[in-house]
Structures are given as C-alpha cells and as structure tokens.
Interface confidence: low
C-alpha cells in the first residue's frame, strides 16, 4: 500500500457508465442534507433546504419522489436573519438538520429556520408526508444549530431526542441535550466548562444505558505551541432525570474522554469527521467505526483514517481514574482521591447526594483515553462521511464494509478482513463538480448506499459485481458482495443458491478458485486466455494493440509466444504495444497483468499478416477467437496520421 | 450459528498434565470480536472461570490458577486448547469452553476424572 | 475483587414470578449476565448486559438492577423453568469474569 494508503483496485470517473449509478434531483431544491429510511427500508425521507422528500426507492434505477412539503422559514425571520448580517442568498433559510422516525405515525424534523431553529412533527399517511402546520412548529433551540455549517448530531432513543449542536447564534455555545418524551429536558451546563466552546458534534449512538456523543473540541488538558484540537466521546446515561437541589435539570451523568486515532510513532488523526455504531449479537462485542482528519497536513496533503472502537474499551475508561482541574496550576492530572457513591457516569437509578453532584460537577473528564484500531490511513483524499454493514462471504465468513465518502464527491468502498487493514475494493467520482458528500444512507433492503449533495441524492448499487468479466478478475476483485458463478460464467451478487459459486476473500487467489479447463490439467502460475482477438497486419502501419488496465493493484508487461517483452526494447504508449510490421513480427501477444502473486492475461492478440498467415498454436486450439479492427498509424510517404481502419475484406 | 466442541482424554494421572481442545465451527477464532475462554464445574458446585484466549493471543487467566495454566489457539485449526499441569483430585470437573465477552455459546462440557 | 451473592434456593409454584437476585457493591452501574443450567447440561445465556435477551429466550425472562441488587425475574413459572441459575459480570478492576454461587430453582 505504500505510503499513499490502499489504492482503489478499480476507479470510476464520474459520467463512467461501467458503474451502475442513478441520480435524483429536483428542480428548485439543493442541500440534501438529512436522510432517513423508512423502518420497512422502502422509503428514503430526505431533509433539504426548506423541504421534506419522501422518495420511493423500492426499484432499482432512479430513486422517485413520492410527495414532498415545504418547510420554509418564515419571511420575518429571513428578515431578521438578514438584518443580523447573515447572507439571504446562502444562510437565511431552512435547513433540516435533524431527521427522525418519532413513532409509526409521525417523523420529526428540525432545521435552522434562517437562525432561528425550529422543531416539528411531521405526520405520515400510507409513508407521504401530509403538510406542516404553522401551529405546531416548536422552539428548536439546542435540537438543530443555528447555522447551517456548524456540525451537528441527534439521535431518537426511547421516544428522547439526543441532541449535540450549537446553541446560539454566534456559534459558541455548544450543548448536548435531551428533549421530547416524559422524562425532564436536560442539557450540558454552560458555566461548568464540560464542553470547549468550539465542541463539533458529529455522531450519536445509543448503547444499553447511555447515549454516547462523538465531537471534537479544542483540548485544555495539555500544554501545546499550538491550538490542538481533540477528538472526544462523551456519555450521558438515559436514565437521568437531573439533580433535586444541584444541577436541576443538568445532566448528572455527563462524562467525556478522549478518543485515540493513530498508528504507531506518528502525530494523531485527531479530528473527528463522522462516527457509526456496526452491532454485534451483544452489544459490548459491539464497534463504533469512525473517520478521523488531521490538523496536520503531513506532505502538504491531506490524509484520513479510520479508526474502530469497541464498545467494551469505552465502557472500561469511563469505569476508569478521572482527571481533575488544579486550581492554582491549571493543569489537569489524574485524580487520586476517594471514589464517591454512585460513581459519577454509573447510571445508578437513586437520587444522587450533594456531595455526589459536587463531586461530579469537576470531575467530567477521564483520565485514560480510548485507543481505536486504524483500519484504514489514506493521504490525498479528506472523508467526511462513512457507512458501514457486515457482509457474509461465500464460506460464511463475516466481513466489515465500509462506504466512505470524500470532501471531492467521490466513494470508496473499503473492506476490513478480519483482524487486518482495510484495502479498497472501487472509488467512485459521483459528484463531476467534486464537491463534497454531505450524507450517506445505507438501505440494505435495496442493496444500496445513498448519498446526499447540494444537488441531488445518488443511488449506489453497494456492489458492481458485473463490470469483473472473468472469474479471475472476480476473485482478485475481493468484494464480499460477489462471486463467480461458473454456469453462468458471470460476476455475480451474491444470493441465497450459490453452492458452487467461487469466491476467495480471505487470498483473493484465482490459483485456488478458477482453476478449470487447461489449468485442472496442469497448475501453472498463469491462466490461459479466454479469447483470442485476431488481429492482420497491414502494410506500412504501425499496429497498436490496446491493454485495458482492469485494476490498479496489478503491475502489466506484454509477451510474444513464451518470451516476456522487455521494456527496453518494446514501444509501450500508454499501456498499447506499438508494433511495426515485419519478419517475426506474427503470432500470440498477451497482455499480461501480475496482482497478487498471480499473473493472468487481460488481452490476447494472434497478428498475422495478408500474405504469411501463421498457423495458430495447438495449445490454443478451443480457445474462442474473433477478428478486431485495432488502431493503425500509417508510416512512409512523408506523411504520418493515425486513423481506425478497417482491415478485413468486405 | 457458532457451535462449541470439547474434546480430551477424559481420565488423568494426579500430578500429569490435562489437555482438552475446543473446536469452533461456524465463527472464527481469528475474530476480533471476541475471547474464548475455558470454565470448570466441580461435580455438585458452581462455575469456575479458568482463562481466556483474545484473536491477538494475549491470555488472561483466574489468579488461583495462573502458575499451573496455559490456553493457546490454533488459528488455522479454528481450535483452542486448554493445558493444566500438576493436576490433583481437586482439578476434577465438568470442563466447557465458551465464546465470550457474555458466554454465549457454551461447548457441552466434557467430564475430566483426576484419579490413579 | 468482586463478589456475588445469590441465596442458594428459590421455591415459586407453576404460573408465578420468581425473582432470583444477586448482590454485589455497586452492581447496578455493571453489565450483569445470567445463565440457566438444567441437570447434565451446560449453562445457557438468559439476560446479558443486564436486561437484554438473546434470541430464543422468552420474554417471561427478564434481568433489572438496582444500586447494589440484581434481579432475574421469571414471570408465569413453567416447570421447565426447574433450573440452577448463575449470575455473573465482569470486574471492573481486573477485567475479569465473577460467577455467584447460583440459586437453584424449584418449581413445586
């Protein structure tokens, strides 16, 4: 992988038609910020600016709208929004930031309301969306930022909203909240400091008695020449219900660490981007993936990981030694005094002592950090988004895989195989103006990933098992998602019947899986072609045999008959061999890709001239053949030009 | 569906060596999602943890055992083994080997008889 | 070091709730699991993380805690309920697994 990261094995430029994709836009809209499936996985609900969508994205192809409302902001507060000298072009309006299902009946949605955020239920019939009333639009302060470009999180648990944003106009008041349901509003207390002013929340994920907050702030815990910013996971436990006397309508539970990003002797990726839960059948085997910046361009590029973080290690360093302020210094060292009881955090059920609340008002943050395991550092790309599900290979075996999208409109699709680094299966340029992807959806149902831009929402197929025409390229290919189906002879996704299916996630080694035909009958370390592409020569014409470079992990060379080519002596123009008819100029020339320890050929040529034609090698004998038209340079004569020609007699 | 077997010679010699093997099948013992781990149960009494393997082969095992105890895995096997040397009587028990963090599933247990 | 109480016996006639506890200092901030063993067989999991159920276990099992108190509730007893009952969680000083004594369950 080198010091870049994994590469993309394969790489689609945007308007590729080798990758099935489908766009949806709709005149009018931008900022398809907020996406929700439906809970039957049939429906996308998108918040836009100053819109709710319902999409039906039932059928492959182009996800269709089924209906959609209008939320705007008021015209007194784009009015008033303007006069605070905020832009009515690109500030002063309704974005949805948050987007949830409140129950069978019922979304709620939240948006920035021209700074002024704003809260509503939102009421569904047969999965449409039925109109807001101006009535019911509640205070939305603390639910959704004020402004559109400041981060944000909120998650539904129990009929509770959790919510991290900003919680003023200005931008430097950051809060984490509960609201909604039958137990008492809480937030985070200003004037305690347990939140830096610049905090950045960017997920939310609940857990069997808390409700963990990811973000980044400034750190105050360490002397540093430079402002150094800190990833942090923070906890609140569900059942608090705030202090009687201290701390009404606080949270009592509130506890912050530092989340660890970093392989081993070098700086840290210490900006947090976007965080996910991938549940395991217990939830403390359970991991939180997450994707990580760095406020240091090593390189003068930027560089991204991903790092996981089991649920288990959070839990231990939020059980764990508590820093605390000194005073006189302030400096933060590891608390050594006497525990109290309940222990801040523990989400003990009983009303908590004063001395307890006292206790827990200064000592918020942890002493150790939690270490995640880099499963993925790539330099030259920044991600800002991540999905990610287990995908069951052919044997059974689980792996993770990863949708991670980039601040240049792209997406990769990375697979962790058990206990190793993560390698890239495909990128993906969907947006041909590269500008960012805001959101990703994975909608498991259709076997899909969507993702949000200012102008439209993508459908990705999560795999592109067809565009792997051989099964050697299939097998190299690594993706979980497909395997090679011998009968068919076809790249498949893979489905419930797919016994003698080939597949190979733990090697990715076509030597053990495609061996079939020739190979059964002796095992070389090189395929036989699939098809022989006939080529004549012409007279007085340079011959360019064309070399498609399927993957970017193979190295290629080009040989004639048995004998390697060498480069030295070999006119390669962007991976074509360039030849000029003459004596021995005939026979088999192949194109050969090496990945993976194995060689196999892309493409086969037999050039044979008009008046010397070359018997074909038995050894080939059965091998399909058809007769192409290649690129020809016509030399001699003074004159030089490059044409298609047709060399076949009509 | 992850399924558990113990296997091992289900008679020892006080002072030998006890070997049982447990055979995963169905999961991965490479996993890193999980530790495997060996647990005991005298005839009439209740669980006793002895250790726990994790997927990086770092072990971890009960303080009242460690000095007679070694569990190892065999990644390409898909197999965890369980040896307990200098064993006495008191090493009589029904002997499991379970997934965890929760211990869920159990292996059916194979009784191993510490007598000369 | 942790430890575990639980009474060794709990009697409960056929449809009524038993209620098997477990006490340990500070339980109620610690993920507790409960297992069932029946006679010859080896133990199976009922309630992990304190009151969360894996799939195949009824929903009459359910696990609560209070501060220094777990509790495996069995409602509307059954008598293939008949069983020992372990609880168990992990210490949270030395990362490693506690088992109480267990308590056995008779269905009259």
């Known amino acids: 992988t080198g010091g870049q990261g994994p590469m993309p094995r394969v790489k689609y430029h945007a308007g590729d038609g080798h990758r099935a994709l489908s766009f949806f836009q709709q005149k009018g809209l931008r900022d398809f910020d907020t996406l929700l499936l439906s809970d039957d996985g049939n429906t996308l609900y998108v918040g836009a600016r100053e819109a709710v969508l319902a999409l039906n994205i039932q059928n492959p192809g182009i996800p269709r709208l089924k209906n959609m409302i209008p939320w705007p902001a008021s015209e007194r507060k784009k009015t008033e929004c303007a006069f605070k000298k905020k832009s009515n072009e690109t500030q002063c309006f309704n974005f949805i930031r948050v987007l949830v299902s409140y129950n069978a009946t019922h979304l709620y949605a939240c948006g920035t309301f021209a700074f002024s955020p704003a809260c509503t239920f939102i009421e569904l019939q047969d999965s449409l969306l039925l109109p807001i009333l101006i009535d019911k639009v509640m205070d939305g302060k603390g639910q959704s930022p004020f402004d559109p470009v400041h981060k944000h999180t909120a998650v539904l648990v129990d009929g509770m909203l959790y919510s991290g944003t900003m919680n003023n106009f200005l931008g430097s008041e950051p809060i984490l909240m509960r609201t909604l349901g039958s137990q008492p509003v809480l937030k985070t207390d200003i004037f305690l400091r347990w939140l830096h002013a610049d905090a950045s929340f960017v997920a939310a994920i609940p857990s069997t008695q808390v409700v963990y907050f990811f973000f980044e702030e400034t750190a105050s815990e360490f002397d540093f020449f430079e402002e150094l910013y800190i990833s942090r996971v923070a906890q609140v436990c569900k059942n608090d219900v705030g202090g009687e006397k201290l701390l009404q309508k606080k949270w009592t539970t509130f506890l912050k660490a530092q989340l660890l990003c970093a392989q081993p002797g070098q700086l840290p990726f210490n900006i947090i981007r976007h965080a996910v839960l991938l549940p395991a059948d217990s939830p403390s085997v359970s991991r939180i993936y997450a994707v990580f910046t760095s406020q240091w361009q090593v390189g003068g590029t930027r560089s991204s990981a991903v790092c996981a973080f089991s649920l288990t290690d959070i839990e231990r360093v939020f059980k764990g030694k508590y820093k605390e302020l000194n005073k006189e210094t302030s400096r933060w060292t590891t608390y050594r005094g006497s525990e109290v009881s309940p222990r801040p955090g523990s989400c003990s059920m009983g009303p908590s002592s004063d001395k307890a609340l006292t206790f827990m008002k200064d000592h918020f943050l942890m002493d150790e950090h939690v270490v995640g395991t880099p499963l993925l550092v790539k330099s030259g790309v920044e991600y800002t988004r991540l999905a990610v599900e287990s995908a069951r290979g052919l044997d059974g075996s689980s792996h993770v895989v990863m949708y991670l999208g980039t601040s240049t409109g792209s997406l990769h699709k990375a697979v962790v195989p058990q206990d190793s680094s993560a390698y890239l299966v495909e990128e993906i340029q969907l947006s041909p103006d590269s500008e960012p992807v805001r959101n990703l959806q994975l909608a498991p149902a259709q076997g899909a990933v969507f993702a949000g831009f200012s102008g439209g929402i993508w459908r990705v197929p999560r795999a592109n098992c067809s565009v792997y025409e051989s099964c050697v390229d299939c097998v190299l290919a690594r993706d979980p998602h497909c395997a090679w189906d011998p009968e068919s002879r076809l790249c498949s996704l893979l489905s419930g019947s797919t016994k003698p299916w080939k597949q190979d996630m733990e090697r990715g080694n076509p030597e053990w899986v495609c061996t079939r035909g020739p190979m059964a009958r002796s095992p070389r370390r090189q395929s036989p072609p699939q098809l022989i592409k006939e080529v004549l020569t012409v007279p007085n014409s340079i011959l360019e045999l064309p070399c498609p470079h399927l993957s970017a992990l193979a190295s290629y060379h080009w040989s004639h008959g048995r004998a390697k080519i060498s480069e030295a002596s070999a006119t390669v123009y962007n991976g074509s061999l360039l030849l000029l008819p003459q004596d021995g100029v005939g026979g088999l020339y192949q194109c050969v890709a090496t990945e993976n320890g194995y060689s196999y050929p892309v493409v086969s040529y037999w050039v044979d001239s008009q008046d010397q034609p070359l018997a074909l090698d038995p050894e080939l004998a059965g091998v399909p053949r058809e007769r192409v038209q290649v690129p020809l340079t016509r030399v001699g004569g003074g004159a030089s030009m490059a044409a298609q020609r047709s060399y076949w007699p009509h | 569906q992850v399924q558990l077997q113990e296997s091992g010679p289900g008679l020892v010699k006080p002072s030998e060596t006890l070997s049982l093997t447990c055979t995963v099948s169905g999961g991965s013992v490479s996993s890193g999602r999980y530790d495997w781990s060996w647990i005991r149960q005298p005839p009439g009494k209740g669980l006793e943890w002895i250790g726990h393997?994790?997927?990086?082969?770092?072990?971890d095992y009960n303080p009242s055992l460690r000095s007679r105890v070694t569990i190892s895995a065999d990644k390409p096997k898909n197999q965890f083994s369980l040896k307990l040397n200098s064993v006495t009587a008191a090493d009589t028990a029904v002997y499991y080997c379970?997934?965890?963090?929760?211990?869920?599933?159990w292996g059916q247990g194979t009784m191993v008889t510490v007598s000369s | 070091q942790s430890v575990l109480t639980q009474p060794p016996s709990v009697s409960v006639a056929p449809g009524q709730t038993a209620s098997l506890t477990c006490g340990a200092n500070?339980?109620?901030?610690?993920?507790v699991q409960w297992y069932q063993q029946k006679p010859g067989q080896a133990p199976v999991l009922v309630v992990y993380d304190g009151s969360d159920r894996p799939s195949g276990i009824p929903d009459r099992f359910s696990g609560s805690s209070s501060e220094n108190t777990a509790t495996l509730t069995i409602s509307r007893v059954e008598a293939g309920d008949e069983a020992d009952y372990y609880c168990q969680l992990w210490d949270s000083v030395t990362d490693r697994p506690v088992f109480g004594g267990g308590t056995k369950v008779t269905v009259l």
């Open positions: 393997i994790y997927y990086t082969g770092i072990t």
């Open positions: 500070n339980i109620g901030s610690k993920s």
């Open positions: 379970a997934r965890g963090p929760f211990f869920d599933p």
